[in-house]
């Protein structure tokens, strides 16, 4: 099985024990590590952070001791914006220039492939996204013809039904991608006005329409029905939780909220907590399991957080094995307890290790 793990370059800026550099990663933990994100400037793939080249080197040095490790560079992301991607993909010359710039950039910096993180193609971009993928793959084939190892091509796709329908021609893009990471998280957010788990495995009994689509099982099944081969589908598992501020004394699933949860001490983003921050939060918190959805949530005071733990990730891995998927994807290594100092287990990357162990179990 593949274990595809994202690393985010901006995690270096978190203060104190939250700061994560690629040299802190475990070279034997994942089969693939994806560095997020690269930029596109003047239609050419480019660095984003001032020290990306140094960090690329740090990451790719991990392969010296584990030659089986593959590294990919992810281009795009939330801050890049869909519009910029759209302009490049819809223009034949811009698209060609971008595509041609990719192999030398990846080769120069020691990456094994490219991950496309266009978040997200609009309805009018659907065909252009397919063309971009098809032409990128053709370039990778051509570039590898004289005896080079062919560069890998993957894409991170939304798990939301509405986005899937408008953004992706699943059957066509699947032909050209080496694997597809389906982002089976962020199904529920503060915009709903109630508490809810952002990455349930199954539909909960409490869910009302349209929430029958807002779970991992539906998204995976839908992708498969649309023509994604199970052998290319990698299922996303988050090492972060989504938090809410409760608006009343109700604390269950579906309780009213006044907004996102308070920012974490390190991640400093309202409504999001890294797993290592959740381990801190759990001291003195009440933990519940949403039985049907097979995921936990915790409450403390007026704070509510839905997250994944070692038990839920094992259930998710069993599910992806039952579905005969290609493996699991983790967002993100730097949100797991990468130092092993927060979650009281004397183990670095406890969630990702639990996924790895479950993938290896017979």
């Amino acid at each position: 099985y593949k274990l595809v793990c994202y690393y985010t370059s901006w995690s270096q800026y978190r203060e104190g024990d939250g700061s994560c550099f690629p040299d802190a990663l475990d070279r034997f933990l994942c089969t693939h590590i994806i560095y997020s994100f690269a930029n596109i400037s003047n239609d050419h793939i480019d660095t984003w952070e001032w020290n990306d080249v140094t960090l690329y080197g740090m990451l790719n040095t991990l392969k010296n001791r584990n030659p089986n490790l593959k590294t990919l560079l992810s281009v795009g992301g939330w801050n890049f914006g869909s519009q910029r991607f759209s302009k490049i993909a819809s223009n034949t010359q811009s698209r060609r220039t971008f595509i041609k710039s990719v192999p030398p950039f990846l080769r120069t910096h020691g990456f094994d492939g490219l991950d496309l993180a266009w978040l997200y193609p609009g309805r009018r971009d659907k065909q252009h996204f397919t063309t971009l993928i098809k032409e990128m793959k053709a370039e990778f084939i051509k570039e590898a013809q004289p005896g080079k190892k062919q560069l890998l091509l993957s894409a991170a796709l939304s798990a939301g039904k509405v986005t899937i329908d408008s953004s992706y021609d699943i059957a066509k893009i699947s032909q050209h991608l080496d694997f597809i990471s389906i982002m089976t998280y962020d199904f529920h957010g503060a915009w709903r006005g109630t508490t809810g788990h952002h990455s349930p495995l199954f539909r909960g009994q409490e869910d009302a329409s349209p929430d029958r689509f807002s779970n991992t099982d539906y998204a995976v099944g839908y992708m498969l029905r649309l023509g994604a081969p199970a052998s290319k589908l990698v299922m996303g598992i988050p090492t972060f939780g989504r938090s809410f501020t409760l608006a009343s004394s109700e604390t269950g699933v579906g309780a009213p909220i006044s907004g996102p949860g308070i920012p974490g001490r390190f991640t400093k983003e309202a409504g999001t907590l890294a797993y290592y921050e959740i381990c801190d939060f759990l001291r003195g918190a009440t933990v519940h399991r949403i039985l049907g959805q097979q995921v936990p949530y915790a409450t403390k005071g007026n704070q509510w957080v839905g997250y994944d733990d070692q038990e839920s990730v094992k259930s998710k891995v069993q599910y992806l094995k039952d579905r005969q998927l290609a493996g699991a994807m983790v967002w993100a290594l730097d949100l797991d307890d990468f130092q092993g100092s927060f979650c009281g287990q004397d183990l670095r990357f406890p969630l990702t290790n639990a996924i790895k162990d479950a993938l290896a179990a017979t």
């Epitope: 060609r96 080769r107 053709a138 084939i141 013809q145 005896g147 080079k148 190892k149």
Partner: antibody, heavy 116, light 111 residues
Framework: EVQLVQSGAEVKKPGATVKISCKVS????????MHWVQQAPGKGLEWMGL????????IYAEKFQGRVTITADTSTDTAYMELSSLRSEDTAVYYC?????????WGQGTTVTVSS | QSVLTQPPSVSAAPGQKVTISCSGS????????VSWYQQLPGTAPKLLIY???KRPSGIPDRFSGSKSGTSATLGITGLQTGDEADYYC???????????FGGGTKLTVLG
């Protein structure tokens, strides 16, 4: 059926320039790089360079840098190799080819003789 | 002087096995795939092995390839007189950004 048909034999004087063509049929010309290979009489294969027919980008071997120009014309599915400032050591058979992995296609070769 | 080093010649009797070595460096053989070509007298080279050990369709399984570190080997079993030819290894060199051939090995089938 795939064919790479090269132009005929050439006899050139030292200092002259030769331009050899390689007409492709049976596959999509822009799908693969086109390489050129030199083989002097009784000697081994020497890689000269390549062109990406899609956009004309080239890579040349250091030995031929400055003397060789490889081009591609997508309107006629033809690749060209031009070698200038010819000297006697350039007497050789020149091949166009899509080297490395299948599909691995080679032209029949063009003999160039450089003699005063 | 070729970037890839091959023995100039090898010989063996019909029915025997022969191996041809190709030695390079980490920037070529070490990090890329090796191809092997057979060139019969007066003809264009023909691909025998690609990606270190794969045979194109139509190439008999008497021909095999392997790679270890910065060296590659072509093996031919059940030698036939028709195998008498020049054999070249080739690969991409990542640091020079060029394709490189070995100097070639002349195979003589004795008898």
């Amino acid at each position: 059926e795939v064919q790479l048909v090269q132009s005929g034999a050439e006899v050139k004087k030292p200092g002259a320039t030769v331009k050899i063509s390689c007409k492709v049929s049976g596959y999509t010309f822009t799908d693969y790089y086109m390489h050129w290979v030199q083989q002097a009489p009784g000697k081994g294969l020497e890689w000269m360079g390549l062109v990406d027919p899609e956009d004309g980008e080239t890579i040349y071997a250091e030995k031929f840098q400055g003397r060789v120009t490889i081009t591609a014309d997508t309107s006629t599915d033809t690749a060209y190799m031009e070698l200038s400032s010819l000297r006697s050591e350039d007497t050789a058979v020149y091949y166009c080819a899509t080297i490395g992995r299948p599909p691995d296609y080679w032209g029949q070769g063009t003999t160039v003789t450089v003699s005063s | 002087q070729s970037v890839l080093t091959q023995p100039p010649s090898v010989s063996a009797a019909p029915g025997q096995k022969v191996t041809i070595s190709c030695s390079g460096s980490s920037s070529n053989i070490g990090n890329n795939y090796v191809s092997w070509y057979q060139q019969l007298p007066g003809t264009a080279p023909k691909l025998l092995i690609y990606d270190n050990n794969k045979r194109p369709s139509g190439i008999p399984d008497r021909f095999s390839g392997s790679k270890s570190g910065t060296s590659a080997t072509l093996g031919i079993t059940g030698l036939q007189t028709g195998d008498e030819a020049d054999y070249y290894c080739g690969t991409w060199d990542s640091s020079l950004s060029v394709w490189v051939f070995g100097g070639g090995t002349k195979l003589t089938v004795l008898g």
